[in-house]
């Protein structure tokens, strides 16, 4: 029947449709128990079941928890909607070194290019600053406007960078000359970013708290709504989001309607035993220092690359950086780059760089 003529306000008496004056057309009346996926549904498939608060309906029609962006280093990029998770990204001044579903498992502060280097590409939420050698005759201290700016937060003195390796690294097969790859990381305590845009009260992402239309018996399009803090998993089951309430955990990504909350070890700790969407055991993370020079590289989700100093200048490890603050945690997928002997689990002297083996256990860099 005609749907675009304003005078068809009775929709030809079809009880399964109603006339929406705002859009001036006939719309499909969602059955009881279902919610429309758009302002003017046209067919049964435009109706859905209602999930619980902070849950979304995933592709398998299961209510799945939205991720949360409550960790200090994350901000909300897109809100939790009825059919998509909330999406988080690293807050300004930080980049994602380990990605996670709809979020970032680990954010690092953008590196400040050291003396003799200039900013080739400024850092983004996904990529760290990329440095390149300064041109001859240019003052290395202020080779580019970006390089003259103060960092968004304090950084560890360059002589004492925190050892990490990129989360995704083909570089793990690269030779290590006299030590580890080191990435500079801010050591100042994370300060809470300005509150991210809240999805509370947004009609666009309302999970379905509005009055509902009837759902007729025998309808195959009725979709369900999970409870708050549950998500609709791939199998279409409402599954509880993991909790990050343990003292040594922080929330990495929030509970969304179609994905679990994920947790990671709090700053200063590293995951020794991983668990689904979380970490079963967190251990303190050692801090190593070294005089380094920067090697430019341009790969997504990798920290600025540093080259270890010449042999004979192997760094010492300190319990914490000079300011006494611990670094951010490292996810189980991250480790220091080590040589072929790193697969052997050995006692860890306080002066030895540490990596995590595939089992999550620390291993010694035999160097």
């Amino acid at each position: 029947f005609p749907q675009d003529r304003p005078f068809e306000d009775t929709c030809h008496g079809n009880p399964s449709h109603y006339y929406d004056k705002a859009v001036r057309r006939c719309c499909y009346r969602c059955p009881m128990g279902l919610f429309p996926t758009q302002q003017c549904p046209q067919r049964p498939t435009d109706c859905r079941k209602q999930c619980e608060p902070d849950y979304y309906l995933d592709e398998a029609d299961r209510c799945t928890a939205c991720v949360t962006c409550s960790r200090d280093d994350l901000v909300e990029k897109t809100p939790c909607a009825w059919n998509s998770s909330r999406v988080c990204e690293c807050r300004p001044g930080m980049f994602c070194s380990t990605s996670a579903v709809n979020s970032c498992a680990r954010c690092f502060f953008h590196s400040v290019c050291p003396a003799g280097m200039i900013v080739k590409f400024p850092g983004t939420a996904q990529k760290n600053t990329v440095c390149e050698p300064a041109s001859p005759g240019v003052s290395p201290a202020c080779a580019s406007p970006e390089n003259c700016k103060e960092p968004s937060s304090g950084t560890i003195p360059q002589a004492k960078p925190t050892p990490v390796s990129p989360a995704t690294s083909s570089a793990s097969t690269m030779p290590v000359r006299g030590g580890t790859r080191l990435a500079q990381e801010a050591a100042s305590k994370l300060t809470r970013a300005p509150d991210s845009p809240s999805s509370v009260g947004r009609p666009s992402s309302d999970p379905g708290l509005s009055p509902t239309q009837p759902c007729p018996e025998g309808s195959g399009d009725c979709r369900k709504q999970c409870e708050p803090d549950y998500y609709l998993d791939e199998a279409g089951r409402c599954t509880a989001c993991v909790s990050c309430s343990r003292d040594d955990l922080v929330e990495k990504t929030p509970c969304a309607w179609n994905s679990s909350r994920t947790c990671e070890c709090r700053p200063g700790m590293i995951c020794a035993t991983s668990a689904t969407n979380s970490c079963a055991r967190c251990v303190p993370y050692p801090i190593c220092a070294a005089e380094t020079v920067t090697k430019p590289q341009d790969m997504a989700e990798k920290d600025t690359t540093f080259e270890a100093p010449p042999l004979g200048t192997q760094p010492d490890c300190n319990p914490t950086p000079e300011n006494g603050e611990a670094p951010a945690s490292t996810s189980p997928t991250q480790s220091l780059l080590v040589d072929s002997q790193a697969s052997k689990t050995l006692p860890i002297p306080t002066s030895a760089p540490v990596a995590l083996s595939s089992t999550g256990k620390p291993v010694l860099d035999a160097g």
Epitope: M32, G33, F35, P53, D61, P211, C215, E227, G236
Partner: antibody, heavy 119, light 111 residues
Framework: EVQLQQSGAELVRPGSSVKISCKAS????????MNWVKQRPGQGLEWIGQ????????NYNGKFKGKATLTADKSSSTAYMQLSSLTSEDSAVYFC????????????WGQGTSVTVSS | EIVLTQSPASLAVSLGQRATISCRAS??????????MLWYQQKPGQPPKLLIY???NVESGVPARFSGSGSGTDFSLNIHPVEEDDIAMYFC?????????FGGGTKLEIK
């Protein structure tokens, strides 16, 4: 008219199991979560869990995991709750209740099924 | 789990007067601009009956003398004027987190 009709009272032995039913009528059974609530004599209400008859999905109160098992039969529009390894602590009235979509309230309740565990 | 502390445990009110029942949650029940707080009335030998949903919305068919208010963690149910038919137990319930929990109940009596 929406109605939830529960099965009759049960007197059972400790250690045994019981399965109580809740037959729904007057609405699309598959499209609403069916909740189960426990009430001991003179006590408050405890939420046991819920099942979505459309696909058998369930949420449980952790306290009742292993104690209660929720199932549903779409063909007969009936929800079931089986209670196992019964003890005197399980003696109570059990209600089924339909959960509204939207505000999560339980708008229609069964009349309740009394379960008495006694040797 | 979220703990709901309901008070008072019992309340005696004269006919025509106001009855106020309080329910405090151990954490916020806010969700997308609404509070997932519910109120039920239960009479002896009967199942609970839904009175209020989303903290302040009166269920259809419920007399206008029942009203709910509050947000976040503090909520209240008001009955005014109280009638004889209101003698019952009143329970608050939260749906913000699984498991859903109920308050301990308030017994309303007539002075």
């Amino acid at each position: 008219e929406v109605q939830l009709q529960q099965s009759g009272a049960e007197l059972v032995r400790p250690g045994s199991s019981v399965k109580i039913s809740c037959k729904a009528s007057g609405y699309a059974f598959s499209s609403y979560w069916m909740n189960w609530v426990k009430q001991r004599p003179g006590q408050g209400l405890e939420w046991i869990g819920q099942i979505y008859p459309g696909d058998g999905d369930t949420n449980y109160n952790g306290k009742f995991k292993g104690k209660a098992t929720l199932t549903a039969d779409k063909s007969s529009s009936t929800a079931y709750m089986q209670l196992s390894s019964l003890t005197s602590e399980d003696s109570a009235v059990y209600f089924c209740a339909r959960r509204i979509n939207g505000n999560f309230a339980m708008d229609y309740w069964g009349q309740g099924t009394s379960v008495t565990v006694s040797s | 789990e979220i703990v709901l502390t309901q008070s008072p445990a019992s309340l005696a009110v004269s006919l025509g007067q106001r009855a106020t029942i309080s329910c405090r949650a151990s954490e916020s029940l806010e969700y997308y601009g609404t509070s997932l707080m519910l109120w039920y009335q239960q009479k002896p030998g009967q199942p609970p009956k839904l009175l209020i949903y989303s903290a302040s919305n009166v269920e259809s068919g419920v007399p206008a003398r029942f009203s709910g208010s509050g947000s976040g963690t503090d909520f209240s149910l008001n009955i005014h004027p109280v009638e004889e038919d209101d003698i019952a137990m009143y329970f608050c319930q939260q749906r913000r987190k699984v498991p859903s929990t109920f308050g301990g109940g308030t017994k309303l009596e007539i002075k």
